[in-house]
């Protein structure tokens, strides 16, 4: 699987999950989140050659098409597969609130 | 929706489904399929700016991150959303067989 275990410990050039830290205030303009100040969101990057973690029959067909037509702009793309939530703390007036933000952290990628 | 109805009738520059015809023999090297000789597979292409048909909370965050960090390589990617099957005919000896190939035709796209 193109997950953090594999990708963070390798020098994989093809589609893999990469490290990305997002600072809520600086990178998103979200000043109201109290904790955490930011988080390891990660992102997906890298080419999707034929048979590299292809998502659907279509992805396989497109990767094969790409192999036969190397100059074509039609190619599978490296995108998130498994996403995890992030708990945050913010204040409503003086009262702290804990919220689970769904689908915030990329754990693995796929070629789609 | 970034579907064939919208995308094929517009000059949309952002993520949209584009026309692509795949010839089984020439483009994939699949000589064994009797009918059809090829099909309109389509493909997804175009940038994914902030708020453009974003798939998950993560896609929204990444698009917003990209807005604040325009030079970053982390950005959502335009990929298939709705896929449809394709019926094909091939021969096993002299006997024709009809098969549904699942997820072969792109009907719409999303930013993931």
């Amino acid at each position: 699987a193109l997950d953090t275990n594999y990708c963070f410990s390798s020098t994989e050039k093809n589609c893999c999950v990469r490290q990305l830290y997002i600072d809520f205030r600086k990178d998103l303009g979200w000043k109201w989140i109290h904790e955490p100040k930011g988080y390891h969101a990660n992102f997906c990057l890298g080419p999707c050659p034929y048979i590299w973690s292809l998502d659907t029959q279509y992805s396989k067909v497109l990767a094969l098409y790409n192999q036969h037509n190397p100059g074509a702009s039609a190619a599978p793309c490296c995108v998130p597969q498994a996403l995890e939530p992030l708990p945050i703390v913010y204040y409503v007036g003086r009262k702290p609130k804990v919220e689970q933000l769904s689908n915030m952290i990329v754990r693995s990628c796929k070629c789609s | 929706a970034l579907d064939t109805n919208y995308c094929f009738s517009s000059t949309e520059k952002n993520c949209c489904v584009r026309q692509l015809y795949i010839d089984f023999r020439k483009d994939l090297g699949w000589k064994w399929i009797h009918e059809p000789k090829g099909y309109h597979a389509n493909f997804c292409l175009g940038p994914c700016p902030y708020i453009w048909s974003l798939d998950t909370q993560y896609s929204k965050v990444l698009a917003l991150y990209n807005q604040h960090n325009p030079g970053a390589s982390a950005a959502p990617c335009c990929v298939p959303q709705a896929l449809e099957p394709l019926p094909i005919v091939y021969y096993v000896g002299r006997k024709p067989k009809v098969e549904q190939l699942s997820n072969m035709i792109v009907r719409s796209c999303k930013c993931s």
């Epitope: 998103l28 303009g29 979200w30 913010y90 204040y91 409503v92 007036g93 003086r94 609130k97 | 902030y50």
Partner: antibody, heavy 121, light 107 residues
Framework: EVQLVQSGAEVKKPGASVKVSCKTS????????MNWVRQAPGAGLDWMGQ????????NYNEMFEGRVTLTADTSTSTAYMELSSLRAGDIAVYYC??????????????WGQGTLVTVSS | DIVMTQTPPSLSVSPRETASISCRAS??????????MHWYLQKPGQSPQLLIY???NLESGVSDRFSGSGSGTDFTLRISRVEANDTGVYYC?????????FGQGTK
């Protein structure tokens, strides 16, 4: 230029529901909280609640007894306020107002033009 | 809930004079070194507009004739060299405690 454009005036029967829209432009919709405030004829301002559009996270004023539902459509940068079980006391101008951005509860720096809701049998 | 009380309920001021409006909160609205108190003006037939943020910070685009002061429970909005265009209802608002609340207004 930041703009908040609300839907037109509504006339509803007692017991019915009303849904007011607030179409935004000129800023990043998922960066700010959106508040809803109402003003009865000749009266002051009452805060109804707020939504963070990226997740649909909401905070409501208990005064509205669970009758108010706030939603947001990030694809069109539009916020919505639905008020159910309408009664005569709900006759008011309803405003959407963007939070200043530093806190969840905050000052409001941009306001819609207001939507008059009339309840009449 | 924090109750905001404005005085006076209405005020008539001659042009070029100074006007003062008071707002008292039923409990302190100070937290983390800030006073969570803001001031708005609602001109006739218009939506409210933000004048002062966090007790004393002038909102951008607002005339410097407006100034805010105070902390804890007692706050004041001053309008110097009053103009006819300043006519309307002035509201204070706190966001230190949920629910956010407004004063009843000063006309």
């Amino acid at each position: 230029e930041v703009q908040l454009v609300q839907s037109g005036a509504e006339v509803k029967k007692p017991g019915a529901s009303v849904k007011v829209s607030c179409k935004t432009s000129g800023y990043t919709f998922i960066t700010y909280w959106m508040n809803w405030v109402r003003q009865a004829p000749g009266a002051g301002l009452d805060w109804m609640g707020q939504i963070f559009p990226a997740w649909g996270m909401t905070n409501y004023n208990e005064m509205f007894e669970g009758r108010v539902t706030l939603t947001a459509d990030t694809s069109t940068s539009t916020a919505y306020m639905e008020l159910s079980s309408l009664r005569a006391g709900d006759i008011a101008v309803y405003y959407c107002a963007r939070g200043y951005g530093n806190y969840a509860l905050d000052a409001m720096d941009y306001w819609g033009q207001g939507t008059l809701v009339t309840v009449s049998s | 809930d924090i109750v905001m009380t404005q005085t006076p309920p209405s005020l008539s001021v001659s042009p070029r004079e100074t006007a003062s409006i008071s707002c008292r909160a039923s409990e302190s609205v100070d937290s983390y070194g800030n006073s969570f108190m803001h001031w708005y003006l609602q001109k006739p037939g218009q939506s409210p507009q933000l004048l002062i943020y966090l007790a004393s910070n002038l909102e951008s685009g607002v005339s410097d004739r407006f100034s805010g002061s105070g902390s804890g429970t007692d706050f004041t909005l001053r309008i110097s060299r009053v103009e006819a265009n300043d006519t309307g209802v002035y509201y204070c608002q706190q966001n230190d405690e949920d629910p956010l609340s407004f004063g009843q207004g000063t006309k």
